[in-house]
Protein backbone atom coordinates (compact mmCIF):
# COMPACT_ATOMS: atom_id res chain seq x y z
CA UNK A 1 0.00 0.00 0.00
CA UNK A 2 1.38 3.44 -0.91
CA UNK A 3 1.52 6.04 1.88
CA UNK A 4 -1.14 8.05 0.10
CA UNK A 5 -3.48 5.10 -0.19
CA UNK A 6 -3.74 4.93 3.60
CA UNK A 7 -5.63 8.24 3.52
CA UNK A 8 -8.50 6.66 1.57
CA UNK A 9 -9.53 3.79 3.82
CA UNK A 10 -12.76 5.48 4.98
CA UNK A 11 -15.19 8.15 3.85
CA UNK A 12 -13.30 11.36 2.99
CA UNK A 13 -14.84 14.85 2.83
CA UNK A 14 -14.43 16.67 -0.49
CA UNK A 15 -14.44 20.37 -1.34
CA UNK A 16 -14.48 21.65 -4.92
CA UNK A 17 -13.97 25.28 -5.97
CA UNK A 18 -14.08 26.40 -9.59
CA UNK A 19 -13.58 29.80 -11.19
CA UNK A 20 -14.55 29.82 -14.84
CA UNK A 21 -14.62 32.12 -17.83
CA UNK A 22 -16.26 30.88 -21.03
CA UNK A 23 -16.36 33.36 -23.94
CA UNK A 24 -16.18 36.12 -21.34
CA UNK A 25 -19.02 34.71 -19.23
CA UNK A 26 -17.46 34.54 -15.75
CA UNK A 27 -18.80 32.21 -13.07
CA UNK A 28 -17.90 30.38 -9.88
CA UNK A 29 -19.00 26.99 -8.56
CA UNK A 30 -18.64 25.51 -5.09
CA UNK A 31 -19.09 21.81 -4.45
CA UNK A 32 -19.04 19.61 -1.38
CA UNK A 33 -19.53 15.97 -0.67
CA UNK A 34 -17.76 12.75 0.14
CA UNK A 35 -15.73 10.01 -1.47
CA UNK A 36 -15.31 6.37 -0.54
CA UNK A 37 -12.48 4.76 -2.49
CA UNK A 38 -13.32 1.31 -1.09
CA UNK A 39 -16.35 1.36 -3.39
CA UNK A 40 -15.11 3.94 -5.89
CA UNK A 41 -18.08 6.08 -4.88
CA UNK A 42 -18.48 9.87 -5.04
CA UNK A 43 -21.44 11.86 -3.74
CA UNK A 44 -21.26 15.57 -4.54
CA UNK A 45 -23.47 18.62 -4.81
CA UNK A 46 -22.46 21.74 -6.71
CA UNK A 47 -23.88 25.26 -6.53
CA UNK A 48 -23.24 28.06 -9.00
CA UNK A 49 -22.44 30.85 -6.53
CA UNK A 50 -22.67 33.59 -9.15
CA UNK A 51 -26.24 32.95 -10.29
CA UNK A 52 -27.14 30.97 -13.38
CA UNK A 53 -24.41 28.75 -14.81
CA UNK A 54 -23.61 29.95 -18.37
CA UNK A 55 -22.78 26.43 -19.62
CA UNK A 56 -24.63 23.11 -19.18
CA UNK A 57 -23.76 21.28 -15.96
CA UNK A 58 -22.82 18.03 -17.74
CA UNK A 59 -19.92 19.79 -19.52
CA UNK A 60 -18.29 20.32 -16.11
CA UNK A 61 -18.62 16.79 -14.72
CA UNK A 62 -15.18 15.68 -15.87
CA UNK A 63 -13.63 18.83 -14.43
CA UNK A 64 -15.29 18.28 -11.04
CA UNK A 65 -15.40 14.56 -10.34
CA UNK A 66 -13.09 13.08 -12.96
CA UNK A 67 -10.82 15.59 -11.25
CA UNK A 68 -10.75 13.56 -8.04
CA UNK A 69 -9.79 10.24 -9.61
CA UNK A 70 -8.05 9.40 -6.33
CA UNK A 71 -11.43 7.96 -5.25
CA UNK A 72 -11.42 5.36 -8.02
CA UNK A 73 -11.60 1.78 -6.76
CA UNK A 74 -8.43 -0.04 -7.71
CA UNK A 75 -8.81 -3.83 -7.24
CA UNK A 76 -6.11 -5.51 -5.13
CA UNK A 77 -4.17 -6.75 -8.15
CA UNK A 78 -4.05 -3.21 -9.61
CA UNK A 79 -3.13 -1.15 -6.54
CA UNK A 80 0.46 -0.72 -7.74
CA UNK A 81 -0.95 1.23 -10.73
CA UNK A 82 -2.83 3.84 -8.68
CA UNK A 83 -0.93 7.06 -9.38
CA UNK A 84 -3.68 9.26 -7.93
CA UNK A 85 -3.59 8.03 -4.33
CA UNK A 86 0.18 7.66 -4.34
CA UNK A 87 0.55 11.41 -4.95
CA UNK A 88 -1.33 12.24 -1.75
CA UNK A 89 -1.42 14.09 0.57
CA UNK A 90 0.67 16.68 -1.33
CA UNK A 91 -1.50 15.99 -4.35
CA UNK A 92 -1.25 16.55 -8.07
CA UNK A 93 -1.75 19.20 -10.69
CA UNK A 94 -4.28 18.16 -13.32
CA UNK A 95 -4.34 19.99 -16.63
CA UNK A 96 -6.80 19.35 -19.42
CA UNK A 97 -7.77 20.58 -22.83
CA UNK A 98 -11.32 19.61 -23.75
CA UNK A 99 -12.25 19.99 -27.43
CA UNK A 100 -15.98 20.12 -28.12
CA UNK A 101 -16.53 18.87 -31.67
CA UNK A 102 -17.54 21.69 -34.04
CA UNK A 103 -17.47 24.14 -31.13
CA UNK A 104 -15.05 25.69 -28.65
CA UNK A 105 -12.72 24.28 -26.03
CA UNK A 106 -12.10 24.37 -22.29
CA UNK A 107 -8.64 24.57 -20.79
CA UNK A 108 -8.52 23.63 -17.12
CA UNK A 109 -5.89 23.61 -14.44
CA UNK A 110 -6.58 22.08 -11.05
CA UNK A 111 -4.69 21.39 -7.86
CA UNK A 112 -6.02 18.32 -6.06
CA UNK A 113 -4.64 17.79 -2.56
CA UNK A 114 -5.46 17.31 1.08
CA UNK A 115 -6.04 20.38 3.22
CA UNK A 116 -6.26 18.88 6.69
CA UNK A 117 -8.51 15.83 6.36
CA UNK A 118 -10.43 17.26 3.39
CA UNK A 119 -9.63 16.45 -0.24
CA UNK A 120 -9.76 19.77 -2.10
CA UNK A 121 -10.04 20.26 -5.87
CA UNK A 122 -9.37 23.90 -6.84
CA UNK A 123 -9.91 24.59 -10.53
CA UNK A 124 -9.48 27.39 -13.03
CA UNK A 125 -11.34 26.97 -16.31
CA UNK A 126 -11.04 29.06 -19.46
CA UNK A 127 -13.35 28.44 -22.41
CA UNK A 128 -12.92 30.04 -25.83
CA UNK A 129 -14.31 29.93 -29.36
CA UNK A 130 -17.80 28.75 -28.42
CA UNK A 131 -20.74 29.53 -30.68
CA UNK A 132 -23.30 31.64 -28.81
CA UNK A 133 -26.15 29.48 -30.17
CA UNK A 134 -24.22 26.18 -30.13
CA UNK A 135 -24.91 23.13 -27.98
CA UNK A 136 -22.91 24.47 -25.05
CA UNK A 137 -23.72 28.18 -24.75
CA UNK A 138 -27.16 27.47 -26.24
CA UNK A 139 -27.86 24.96 -23.44
CA UNK A 140 -28.95 22.19 -25.81
CA UNK A 141 -27.49 19.28 -23.81
CA UNK A 142 -29.71 16.86 -21.93
CA UNK A 143 -29.26 16.73 -18.17
CA UNK A 144 -27.80 13.23 -17.99
CA UNK A 145 -24.48 11.44 -18.30
CA UNK A 146 -23.19 8.40 -20.13
CA UNK A 147 -20.72 5.77 -18.94
CA UNK A 148 -17.17 6.14 -20.23
CA UNK A 149 -13.74 4.55 -20.14
CA UNK A 150 -10.84 6.81 -19.19
CA UNK A 151 -7.49 5.61 -20.58
CA UNK A 152 -4.36 6.11 -18.47
CA UNK A 153 -0.68 5.76 -19.37
CA UNK A 154 2.53 6.65 -17.54
CA UNK A 155 4.46 9.79 -18.45
CA UNK A 156 7.89 8.90 -17.07
CA UNK A 157 9.51 12.13 -18.25
CA UNK A 158 7.18 14.21 -16.09
CA UNK A 159 6.91 11.63 -13.29
CA UNK A 160 3.15 11.59 -13.90
CA UNK A 161 0.47 10.29 -16.22
CA UNK A 162 -1.28 11.15 -19.46
CA UNK A 163 -4.99 10.45 -19.81
CA UNK A 164 -7.22 10.46 -22.90
CA UNK A 165 -10.93 9.88 -23.33
CA UNK A 166 -13.92 10.99 -25.36
CA UNK A 167 -17.14 12.06 -23.64
CA UNK A 168 -20.49 11.65 -25.38
CA UNK A 169 -22.99 14.30 -24.32
CA UNK A 170 -26.59 13.66 -25.31
CA UNK A 171 -28.26 16.56 -27.14
CA UNK A 172 -31.97 17.35 -26.85
CA UNK A 173 -32.55 16.58 -30.56
CA UNK A 174 -31.28 13.01 -30.10
CA UNK A 175 -27.79 13.54 -31.48
CA UNK A 176 -24.48 13.50 -29.59
CA UNK A 177 -21.95 16.21 -28.74
CA UNK A 178 -18.44 14.77 -28.53
CA UNK A 179 -15.85 16.20 -26.13
CA UNK A 180 -12.25 15.05 -26.58
CA UNK A 181 -10.23 15.16 -23.37
CA UNK A 182 -6.44 15.42 -23.20
CA UNK A 183 -5.22 15.28 -19.63
CA UNK A 184 -1.90 15.43 -17.84
CA UNK A 185 -1.25 14.84 -14.13
CA UNK A 186 1.98 15.70 -12.33
CA UNK A 187 2.70 15.34 -8.61
CA UNK A 188 2.98 18.46 -6.46
CA UNK A 189 5.33 16.88 -3.93
CA UNK A 190 8.72 15.33 -4.62
CA UNK A 191 8.00 12.01 -2.90
CA UNK A 192 7.80 8.77 -4.90
CA UNK A 193 4.65 8.12 -6.94
CA UNK A 194 3.36 5.00 -8.67
CA UNK A 195 3.74 5.13 -12.46
CA UNK A 196 1.18 2.73 -13.92
CA UNK A 197 1.05 0.29 -16.77
CA UNK A 198 -1.59 1.22 -19.34
CA UNK A 199 -5.11 0.69 -17.97
CA UNK A 200 -8.48 2.41 -17.82
CA UNK A 201 -11.10 3.70 -15.39
CA UNK A 202 -14.69 2.63 -15.95
CA UNK A 203 -17.01 5.46 -14.86
CA UNK A 204 -20.75 5.59 -14.22
CA UNK A 205 -22.34 8.89 -13.30
CA UNK A 206 -25.89 9.87 -12.35
CA UNK A 207 -26.99 13.52 -12.33
CA UNK A 208 -29.98 14.67 -10.32
CA UNK A 209 -31.57 17.76 -8.80
CA UNK A 210 -32.54 18.59 -5.23
CA UNK A 211 -36.25 19.42 -5.47
CA UNK A 212 -35.95 21.86 -2.56
CA UNK A 213 -32.90 23.73 -3.90
CA UNK A 214 -33.57 27.17 -5.37
CA UNK A 215 -29.97 27.86 -6.44
CA UNK A 216 -28.64 26.64 -9.80
CA UNK A 217 -27.10 23.32 -8.88
CA UNK A 218 -26.17 19.74 -9.76
CA UNK A 219 -26.21 16.61 -7.60
CA UNK A 220 -23.77 13.93 -8.75
CA UNK A 221 -23.44 10.28 -7.78
CA UNK A 222 -20.53 8.47 -9.42
CA UNK A 223 -18.86 5.06 -9.34
CA UNK A 224 -15.37 4.60 -10.78
CA UNK A 225 -13.42 1.33 -10.99
CA UNK A 226 -9.99 0.67 -12.49
CA UNK A 227 -9.70 -2.18 -14.99
CA UNK A 228 -7.69 -3.37 -17.95
CA UNK A 229 -4.81 -5.14 -16.22
CA UNK A 230 -5.17 -8.87 -15.67
CA UNK A 231 -3.80 -10.89 -12.75
CA UNK A 232 -0.15 -11.84 -13.17
CA UNK A 233 0.81 -15.44 -13.95
CA UNK A 234 1.72 -16.02 -10.30
CA UNK A 235 -1.87 -15.16 -9.37
CA UNK A 236 -3.24 -17.69 -11.87
CA UNK A 237 -1.27 -20.51 -10.32
CA UNK A 238 -2.24 -19.84 -6.69
Amino acid sequence: MSKGEELFTGVVPILVELDGDVNGHKFSVSGEGEGDATYGKLTLKFICTTGKLPVPWPTLVTTFSYGVQCFSRYPDHMKQHDFFKSAMPEGYVQERTIFFKDDGNYKTRAEVKFEGDTLVNRIELKGIDFKEDGNILGHKLEYNYNSHNVYIMADKQKNGIKVNFKIRHNIEDGSVQLADHYQQNTPIGDGPVLLPDNHYLSTQSALSKDPNEKRDHMVLLEFVTAAGITHGMDELYK
Epitope: L15, E34, T43, K45, G116
Partner: nanobody, 123 residues
Framework: DVQLVESGGGLVQAGGSLRLSCTAS????????IGWFRQAPGKEREFVGI????????YYADSVKGRFTISRDNAKNTVYLQMNSVKPADAAVYSC??????????????????RGQGTQVTV
Protein backbone atom coordinates in the same frame (compact mmCIF):
# COMPACT_ATOMS: atom_id res chain seq x y z
CA ASP B 1 -31.75 11.34 -2.86
CA VAL B 2 -29.11 13.50 -1.18
CA GLN B 3 -30.84 15.61 1.43
CA LEU B 4 -31.21 16.78 5.02
CA VAL B 5 -34.61 16.56 6.72
CA GLU B 6 -35.48 18.30 9.99
CA SER B 7 -38.19 17.03 12.31
CA GLY B 8 -39.40 17.46 15.89
CA GLY B 9 -40.73 21.00 15.65
CA GLY B 10 -44.04 22.03 17.18
CA LEU B 11 -45.62 23.93 20.03
CA VAL B 12 -43.67 24.23 23.30
CA GLN B 13 -44.44 26.11 26.49
CA ALA B 14 -42.07 28.82 27.67
CA GLY B 15 -39.59 27.13 30.01
CA GLY B 16 -40.21 23.78 28.34
CA SER B 17 -38.05 21.50 26.20
CA LEU B 18 -38.02 20.24 22.63
CA ARG B 19 -35.65 18.05 20.62
CA LEU B 20 -35.16 18.69 16.92
CA SER B 21 -33.60 16.13 14.57
CA CYS B 22 -31.61 16.58 11.37
CA THR B 23 -31.40 13.32 9.43
CA ALA B 24 -29.24 12.87 6.34
CA SER B 25 -30.04 10.60 3.42
CA UNK B 26 -27.42 9.88 0.77
CA UNK B 27 -24.74 11.46 2.97
CA UNK B 28 -22.54 10.15 5.77
CA UNK B 29 -23.35 12.63 8.52
CA UNK B 30 -20.11 12.01 10.44
CA UNK B 31 -18.19 13.44 7.46
CA UNK B 32 -19.71 16.91 7.88
CA UNK B 33 -19.89 19.80 10.30
CA ILE B 34 -23.60 20.19 11.03
CA GLY B 35 -24.88 23.68 11.74
CA TRP B 36 -28.26 24.75 13.09
CA PHE B 37 -29.82 28.06 12.06
CA ARG B 38 -33.11 29.77 12.81
CA GLN B 39 -35.22 32.47 11.25
CA ALA B 40 -38.12 34.26 12.94
CA PRO B 41 -40.70 36.11 10.83
CA GLY B 42 -39.36 39.44 9.62
CA LYS B 43 -35.92 38.78 11.04
CA GLU B 44 -32.54 37.78 9.65
CA ARG B 45 -31.58 34.12 9.72
CA GLU B 46 -29.20 33.54 12.65
CA PHE B 47 -26.61 30.97 13.56
CA VAL B 48 -27.64 28.78 16.51
CA GLY B 49 -24.75 26.34 16.84
CA ILE B 50 -22.60 23.71 15.18
CA UNK B 51 -21.17 20.28 15.88
CA UNK B 52 -17.81 19.58 14.31
CA UNK B 53 -17.22 16.37 12.36
CA UNK B 54 -15.22 13.48 13.83
CA UNK B 55 -16.07 14.37 17.39
CA UNK B 56 -18.34 16.08 19.87
CA UNK B 57 -16.89 19.61 19.70
CA UNK B 58 -19.72 22.14 19.64
CA TYR B 59 -20.04 25.91 19.37
CA TYR B 60 -23.13 27.98 20.20
CA ALA B 61 -24.48 31.47 19.71
CA ASP B 62 -24.48 33.48 22.93
CA SER B 63 -28.29 33.67 22.84
CA VAL B 64 -28.66 29.89 23.33
CA LYS B 65 -25.49 28.99 25.24
CA GLY B 66 -26.25 26.89 28.32
CA ARG B 67 -29.79 26.12 27.13
CA PHE B 68 -29.33 24.36 23.77
CA THR B 69 -27.19 21.27 23.15
CA ILE B 70 -26.18 19.71 19.82
CA SER B 71 -25.30 16.02 19.65
CA ARG B 72 -24.98 13.39 16.96
CA ASP B 73 -25.84 9.74 16.49
CA ASN B 74 -23.75 8.51 13.57
CA ALA B 75 -25.47 5.11 13.56
CA LYS B 76 -28.79 6.88 12.88
CA ASN B 77 -27.14 9.41 10.55
CA THR B 78 -28.80 12.11 12.64
CA VAL B 79 -27.83 15.26 14.55
CA TYR B 80 -30.02 16.58 17.37
CA LEU B 81 -30.71 20.03 18.76
CA GLN B 82 -31.91 19.73 22.36
CA MET B 83 -33.71 22.92 23.35
CA ASN B 84 -34.20 23.49 27.10
CA SER B 85 -35.59 26.47 29.04
CA VAL B 86 -37.23 27.66 25.85
CA LYS B 87 -38.09 31.38 25.63
CA PRO B 88 -40.63 33.17 23.43
CA ALA B 89 -37.66 34.68 21.54
CA ASP B 90 -36.71 31.13 20.43
CA ALA B 91 -39.80 30.83 18.22
CA ALA B 92 -38.61 30.45 14.62
CA VAL B 93 -38.12 28.06 11.72
CA TYR B 94 -35.09 25.93 12.55
CA SER B 95 -33.01 24.44 9.77
CA CYS B 96 -29.81 22.42 9.62
CA UNK B 97 -26.99 22.44 7.12
CA UNK B 98 -24.01 20.20 6.39
CA UNK B 99 -20.62 21.48 5.30
CA UNK B 100 -17.03 20.27 5.11
CA UNK B 101 -15.86 23.86 5.65
CA UNK B 102 -14.58 25.01 9.02
CA UNK B 103 -14.09 28.39 10.66
CA UNK B 104 -16.20 31.46 9.97
CA UNK B 105 -17.74 29.98 6.81
CA UNK B 106 -19.46 27.34 8.93
CA UNK B 107 -21.44 30.10 10.68
CA UNK B 108 -22.69 31.58 7.40
CA UNK B 109 -25.91 29.97 6.13
CA UNK B 110 -25.19 31.10 2.57
CA UNK B 111 -21.97 29.08 2.44
CA UNK B 112 -23.84 25.81 3.07
CA UNK B 113 -24.36 23.63 0.03
CA UNK B 114 -26.45 21.00 1.84
CA ARG B 115 -29.47 22.53 3.62
CA GLY B 116 -32.69 21.24 5.08
CA GLN B 117 -36.15 22.74 4.55
CA GLY B 118 -36.69 23.64 8.21
CA THR B 119 -39.10 22.82 11.02
CA GLN B 120 -41.30 25.33 12.85
CA VAL B 121 -40.93 25.90 16.59
CA THR B 122 -43.74 27.86 18.24
CA VAL B 123 -43.55 29.07 21.86
Amino acid sequence: DVQLVESGGGLVQAGGSLRLSCTASGLTISTYNIGWFRQAPGKEREFVGIIIRNGDTTYYADSVKGRFTISRDNAKNTVYLQMNSVKPADAAVYSCGATVRAGAAAEQYNSYIFRGQGTQVTV
